[in-house]
């Protein structure tokens, strides 16, 4: 807290400019009018205020807007955003994607902070759903964003938004999350032809049921082992040896290297030895 002192003669700020960089904290408190600051927020980020000076500027805005900042101020916060607490952010109403992008840019290079998580939560709740543009923006800044959501939160993702999802965005998703995302992806990509469809749906297959895997096995997709190993065990178990052979194509030889790991191990144990022998891989059921 900066104590109240009178502004020295000739130091009253007429505008937010670089001369303020060399003001001490108490001078900023005494000589910068909060309303002036609010109307010239776009200049604040262009001026390299110090960490401690930004505390003073935040204090001024907090006094001016005790119920929360208006979006006209929020979109120009720049480095002041890093001074905000989740409690501050919960008072905001952020509706513009440009505002969201501007604030995420400030946090670039850092892990997702509680402030950013709160900001995103406020933004998405305000929109009512995770639309494609929002998802595009969030996954560009935080590739793991989608997998940080609960299955309940993922249920609000419309199928049209799935087009924005890249394979790496799903790297840390667990089966419960893929269970929610897979049907949406299936719907989103339903009008694509066989090989193109497989390229798009591949990352989501950890949520696919047995009947969809059986259907894929009829389409010469040549699924790689990495994708196969991420399939749900309960979806793989009912597949026949012939179906797995068709599903994997030339990659079927990779089963030998994975024979001790799920779901391959459990699938092998469900097959007749005669059928396994047709693969010529020496798999023992």
């Amino acid at each position: 807290e900066v104590e109240k002192t009178a502004c020295p003669s000739g130091k009253k700020a007429r505008e937010i400019d670089e001369s303020l960089i060399f003001y001490k904290k108490w001078e900023l408190e005494a000589c910068v009018d909060a309303a002036l600051l609010a109307t010239q927020m776009d200049r604040v980020n262009a001026i390299p205020f110090t960490y401690e000076q930004l505390d003073v500027l935040k204090h001024k805005l907090d006094e001016l807007y005790p119920q929360g900042y208006p979006e006209s101020v929020i979109q120009h916060l720049g480095y002041l955003f890093l001074k905000m607490s989740p409690e501050d952010i919960r008072k905001w109403n952020v509706t513009s994607l440009e505002t969201l992008k501007a604030l995420l840019e400030v946090n670039k290079g850092h892990e997702m902070s509680p402030q950013v998580a709160t900001l995103i939560d406020r933004f998405v709740k305000g929109r009512g759903q995770l639309d494609k543009d929002t998802l595009d923006t969030l996954t560009a800044f935080y590739p793991g964003y989608l997998c940080s959501l609960s299955p309940e939160e993922l249920s609000s993702v419309p199928p049209s938004s799935i087009w924005a999802v890249r394979p790496q965005d799903l790297d840390t998703c667990d089966p419960r999350q893929l269970d929610v995302l897979y049907p949406k992806a299936r719907l989103a990509f339903q009008n694509m032809n066989g090989s193109e469809y497989f390229v798009k749906i591949q990352s989501f297959l950890g949520g696919a049921p047995t009947e969809d895997l059986k259907a894929l096995s009829q389409q010469n997709v040549s699924m790689d082992l990495a994708t196969f190993m991420k399939l749900r065990t309960d979806a793989v178990l009912p597949l026949t040896v012939a179906e797995v052979q068709k599903l994997l194509g030339p990659h079927v030889e990779g089963l030998k290297a994975e024979e001790r790991h799920r779901p391959v191990r459990d699938w092998i144990l469900r097959q007749r030895q005669d059928d396994l022998d047709t693969l010529g891989l020496g798999l023992q059921g």
Epitope: P48, F49, T50, Y51, V106, G109
Partner: nanobody
Framework: QVQLQESGGGLVQPGGSLRLSCAAS????????ASWYRQAPGKQRELVAT???????FHLGSVKGRFTISRDNAKRTVYLQMNSLLPEDTAVYYC?????WGQGTQVTVSS
């Protein structure tokens, strides 16, 4: 937090030059403005120069034309080139990036 390490201080005669360097430990150095402060014995710490992440530089009135702040984001380093040094420039010089501070490097200007 970014770790900062200053170097380049020392004893120099009036009118001489020194170049201070401050190396940062993390790549996010380039996200922030960087500053040099100084503190003379018995005085308050003062901001000498600051450089925005865009490269715009600002200098305290009393050092303008003598001191120049610069940065090399690839090397995660901020510099302070000090020319025409005066006895009143004697102080411990500190590097600052966001909420991180260096340990300080002593600059003494004396004949």
């Amino acid at each position: 937090q970014v770790q900062l390490q200053e170097s380049g201080g020392g004893l120099v005669q009036p009118g001489g030059s020194l170049r201070l360097s401050c190396a940062a430990s993390e790549s996010i150095f380039s996200n922030y403005s960087a500053s040099w402060y100084r503190q003379a014995p018995g005085k308050q710490r003062e901001l000498v120069a600051t450089i925005a992440r865009t490269g715009s530089a600002f200098h305290l009135g009393s050092v303008k034309g003598r001191f120049t702040i610069s940065r090399d984001n690839a090397k995660r380093t901020v510099y302070l080139q000090m020319n025409s040094l005066l006895p009143e420039d004697t102080a411990v010089y500190y590097c600052n990036v966001w909420d991180s501070w260096g340990q300080g490097t002593q600059v003494t200007v004396s004949s």
